[in-house]
């Protein structure tokens, strides 16, 4: 029956068909769907999906969604169909299809599991046994990320005090879009015992830099001259450095921040590769000077901005005087 | 001595097209970045976006994505702001400021006022 | 995205007298971050105060900045005819919306 358009725009259509969902990797939740049965031939099916907590709302022409999620709850997508791209359109019954995450004990699932990408060179998770599970549970960590063409398996299981941990290796590559994208993980025990857990690691936080290393500490007139190599793997914008110097006569402890800086001076070894030097102003040469210096990532570059690396390897300058 | 000199004000109708400019001296322009303020009249500061001339990399606030272009021409340490079609609401004055990792704004220009009146 | 809250928004004092200003994150940040500016009528915004606490060039000892976390406070121990001004807080992309100091 032939419908003028004012009245297939308003009229509500069949529901999608054949909803279903699968899982990717470890972490990628797709949810593919067919056109409903018996719509509007002049209809140009959009189709409205959303979340169960009507979040992540989205009108678009494909037959697919996919959500990249730490499968460690339920979740739920809901999908209707319609005709026009209008969100105020009433879409048809929506259809629901949720995943839920593997069965086992919540109780035994691992805790507070969180990695760091150390210096763009190689990534550290750690975890906590969960409350109901054996003491001598063999943890094993999976991990997968776009430039890796299966999931991998985690070798260098290890254990620091409560915690235990796996490291491997993920360097940074130049695809200037690796950054944007995401390491997804999964922990759970040899013996299928435990219940799995998840987590979703965005490589634009927790990158921890190396500490730097103090090359050369010299004195010029009342200045003291600072130079050190930079970490690798990092471009000079991501960074920032900050220079302590503690003074053993007066007891003072001076911090400064320092953006990476051209060894310019003659004090310095120049143009040597990757290093940054920083003059200090005002110091008694007279007197016992220790330096030590951090490093931490620009927000503009490295979202998490509350890590910094270890700090360096202290190095000292002047005399110690004798306390008369 | 970091000095950043900007351009002059600028009277401009709606739908026209501007770009000021923003030169810095006293340091090595390529290895700090450019932050662009804008200060509508009676208000307050609201960051706009920033410049990295050492490789032109930029980043924009939301709510200024797609409204401005932030550019820099290394080679005479200059970096401009930029409007394809003006509206009465960019009137303003718009600050260039320098800006090292950490995020602060640490000299900023003397500022440009952008008036736009039909 | 975070947003900076100063308050008060007005702080009515007289010279001499000690000034406290509030500025509250809407989430944790990093305090090597925020940075305190000073701003007086018809002129560009002058930077006080970068992490949290460090003094910029040229800054008078008068003025310090401290907290952590959400909460972070510039302190003016004792104000000069100079200071009464309007002072900003600010992270990266955000700035709170200002606090005038003006001359009870």
């Known amino acids: 029956d032939y419908k003028d358009d004012d009245e297939s725009r308003t009229e509500t259509q069949p529901p999608v068909t054949n909803l279903s969902v699968s899982v990717e990797n470890l972490c990628t939740v797709i949810w593919t769907w067919n056109p409903p049965e018996g719509a509007s031939s002049n209809c140009s099916l959009w189709y409205f999906s959303h979340f169960g907590d009507k979040q992540d709302k989205k009108i678009a022409p494909e037959t697919r969604r996919s959500i990249e999620v730490p499968l460690n709850e339920r979740i739920c997508l809901q999908v209707g169909s319609q005709c026009s791209t209008n969100e105020s359109e009433k879409p048809s019954i929506l259809v629901e299809k949720c995943i839920s995450p593997p069965e086992g004990d919540p109780e035994s699932a691992v805790t507070e599991l969180q990695c760091i990408w150390h210096n763009l060179s190689y990534m550290k998770c750690s975890w906590l046994p969960g409350r109901n599970t054996s003491p001598d549970t063999n943890y094993t960590l999976y991990y997968w990320h776009r430039s890796l063409e299966k999931i991998h398996q985690c070798e260098n299981i290890f254990r620091e005090g409560q915690y235990f941990g796996c490291s491997f290796d993920l360097t940074k590559v130049k695809d200037s879009s690796f950054e944007q994208h995401s390491v997804q993980i999964m922990v759970k025990d040899n013996a299928g015992k435990i219940k799995p857990s998840f987590n979703i690691v965005p490589l634009t936080s927790r990158v921890k830099p190396d500490p730097p290393h103090i090359k050369n500490l010299s004195f010029h007139n009342d200045d003291l001259y600072v130079q050190w190599e930079n970490p690798q793997n990092f471009i000079s914008r991501c960074l920032f450095y900050e220079v302590e110097v503690n003074n053993s006569q007066t007891e003072t402890h001076n911090v400064f921040y320092v953006q990476e800086a051209k060894c310019e001076n003659p004090e310095f070894e120049r143009n040597v590769e990757n290093t940054s030097c920083f003059m200090v102003p005002g110091v008694l040469p007279d007197t016992l000077n220790t330096v030590r210096i951090r490093v931490k990532t620009n927000k503009l570059c490295y979202e998490d901005d509350k890590l910094w690396s270890n700090w360096s390897q202290e190095m000292s300058i002047g005399k110690k005087r004798n306390s008369t | 001595e970091v000095q950043l000199v900007q351009s002059g004000a600028e009277v401009k109708k709606p739908g026209e097209s501007l770009k000021i400019s923003c030169k810095g001296s006293?340091?090595?322009?390529?290895?700090?970045?450019i932050g662009w303020v804008r200060q509508m009249p009676g208000k307050g500061l609201e960051w706009m976006g920033v410049?990295?001339?050492?490789?032109?990399?930029?980043r924009y606030s939301p709510s200024f994505q797609g409204q401005v272009t932030i550019s820099a021409d290394k080679s005479i340490s200059t970096a401009y702001l930029q409007w394809s079609s003006l509206k009465a609401s960019d009137t303003a004055m718009y600050y260039c400021?320098?800006?090292?990792?950490?995020?602060?704004?640490?000299?900023w220009g003397q500022g440009t006022l952008v008036t736009v009146s039909s | 995205e975070i947003v900076l809250t100063q308050s008060p928004g007005t702080l009515s004092l007289s010279p001499g007298e000690r000034a406290t200003l509030s500025c509250r994150a809407s989430?944790?940040?990093?305090?090597?971050?925020l940075a305190w500016y000073q701003q007086k009528p018809g002129q560009a915004p002058r930077l006080l105060i970068y992490?949290?606490?460090s003094r910029a060039t040229g800054i008078p000892d008068r003025f310090s900045g401290s907290g952590s976390g959400t909460d972070f406070t510039l302190t003016i121990s004792r104000l000069e005819p100079e200071d009464f001004a309007v002072y900003y807080c600010?992270?990266?992309?955000?700035f709170g919306q200002g606090t005038k100091v003006e001359i009870k």
């Open positions: 992490g949290a606490s």
């Open positions: 600010q992270q990266y992309e955000t």
């Open positions: 410049i990295y001339p050492g490789d032109s990399y930029t």
């Open positions: 400021a320098r800006m090292p990792n950490w995020g602060s704004l640490d000299s």
């Open positions: 006293g340091y090595s322009f390529t290895s700090y970045w």
């Open positions: 989430q944790s940040i990093s305090s090597s971050y």
